[in-house]
């Protein structure tokens, strides 16, 4: 019986509200045996693949995508997808990255720790079939 791949989850450390110039790390998680994790922007025209996978637990693998110095252009929704041979998974839910000015006024939101988007029960759009094979475009280990 063909394996049903669970949807990945995505989270951000230290959170989803990041001061301009600070760093953020997106963490993608999936089942064991994942070969490639991909972090996508909303349009899917911009993405980054990594094969620096680690085993987060006996049943879970993860990859980390770090942006060293966040700019306003980094703001927006991100999601994860993974390749577990021979299939691509569905996409995770979106996680919205907010970039705030460092002036730190009274109305500035604090960094939200441990923000994440996990699997949900909504049906798949099957768009994972459109993705390139895992052997393509696996160079950069940082997003920008």
């Amino acid at each position: 019986q063909e394996e049903d791949l669970p949807r990945p989850s995505i989270s951000a450390e230290p959170g989803t509200v990041i001061p301009l110039g600070s760093h953020v790390t997106f963490v993608c998680r999936g089942p064991v045996g994942v070969q490639t994790f991909r972090l996508e922007r909303e349009s899917r025209s911009t993405y980054n693949d990594t094969e620096d996978v680690s085993q987060a637990s006996p049943s879970e693998s993860e990859a980390r995508f770090r942006i060293d110095s966040v700019s306003e252009g980094n703001a927006g929704p991100y999601r994860c997808i993974y390749y577990k041979p021979p299939k691509w998974s569905e996409q995770s839910d979106y996680l919205e990255l907010l970039v705030k000015e460092t002036s730190g006024g009274p109305d500035s939101p604090d960094t939200e720790p441990g923000s994440s988007a996990g699997p949900t029960q909504r049906p798949s759009d099957n768009s994972h079939n459109e993705h390139a094979p895992a052997s393509q475009g696996l160079k950069a280990e940082h997003l920008y």
């Epitope: 064991v32 045996g33 070969q35 990594t50 094969e51 996978v53 085993q55 041979p85």
Partner: antibody
């Protein structure tokens, strides 16, 4: 206990063909594994030939040098075969089948003992 | 095509000592690398997967590490039973499951 065993090794004349069989015991190829073939020439290193996904998709994946002359097929829930054609003396080797599993990230945690193939006139 | 260059081709070390085997990948394979031990007349035995994770039942004297495209297998507190040939292997589906050339280990 889970195990793999290769069979079909033989003495074959150059330009001949041969089919090797990998048989599983204690588990079935209906689960999500990659069943792979590796060969080792006498006194030399290991050479990867290719793999087949044991799930329903049956995806295959070959070393570039093996494409066209070697074919891996799943023939039943417990057997996978390696068909070899246009054999030459350079194909003389011990042939192993091995199982790649997700929990060891497609490393080969289970191997058969190997079967010897000799190509000679 | 991916090439894995293993060094040294052979090494001799004393019982109780430590030795290091290196495996250099010609392309990026992330953490998708395994190490095996093979003794004469036997199939290979999995030691390390995903570059640094110890396979079930394997002694903690074996340690795998990675720096970019260079991978290292370290065997500490060498035992006579460690005498064998060691191979690295890419487990990357895009680049092929290539093996390194092997390192023969002699324990004195």
């Amino acid at each position: 206990e889970q195990s793999l065993e290769e069979s079909g090794g033989d003495l074959v004349k150059p330009e001949g063909s041969l089919t090797l069989t990998c048989t599983a015991s204690g588990f079935s190829f209906n689960s999500n594994y990659w069943i792979c073939w590796v060969r080792q020439t006498p006194g030399k290193g290991l050479e990867w030939i290719g793999c087949i996904y044991s799930g329903s998709s049956g995806d295959t994946y070959y070393a570039s040098w093996a494409k066209g002359r070697f074919t891996i097929s799943k023939t039943s829930s417990t057997t996978v075969t390696l068909q070899m054609t246009s054999l030459t003396a350079a194909d003389t080797a011990t042939y192993f089948c091995a199982r790649g599993a997700d929990y060891v990230y497609w490393s080969y945690g289970l191997w058969g003992p190997g079967t010897l193939v000799t190509i000679s006139s | 095509e991916l090439v894995l260059t293993q060094t040294p081709a052979s090494v001799s070390a004393a019982v109780g000592g430590t030795l290091t085997i290196k495996c250099q990948a010609s392309e990026t394979i992330g953490t998708n690398l395994a190490w095996y031990q093979q003794k004469p007349g036997q199939p290979p035995k999995l030691l390390i997967y995903l570059a640094s994770y110890l396979a079930s039942g394997v002694s903690s004297r074996f340690k795998g590490s990675r720096s970019g495209t260079e991978f290292t297998l370290t065997i500490s507190d060498l035992d006579c039973d460690d005498a064998a040939t060691y191979y690295c292997q890419s487990t990357h589906f895009g680049n092929g499951h290539t093996f390194g050339g092997g390192t023969e280990v002699v324990v004195k």
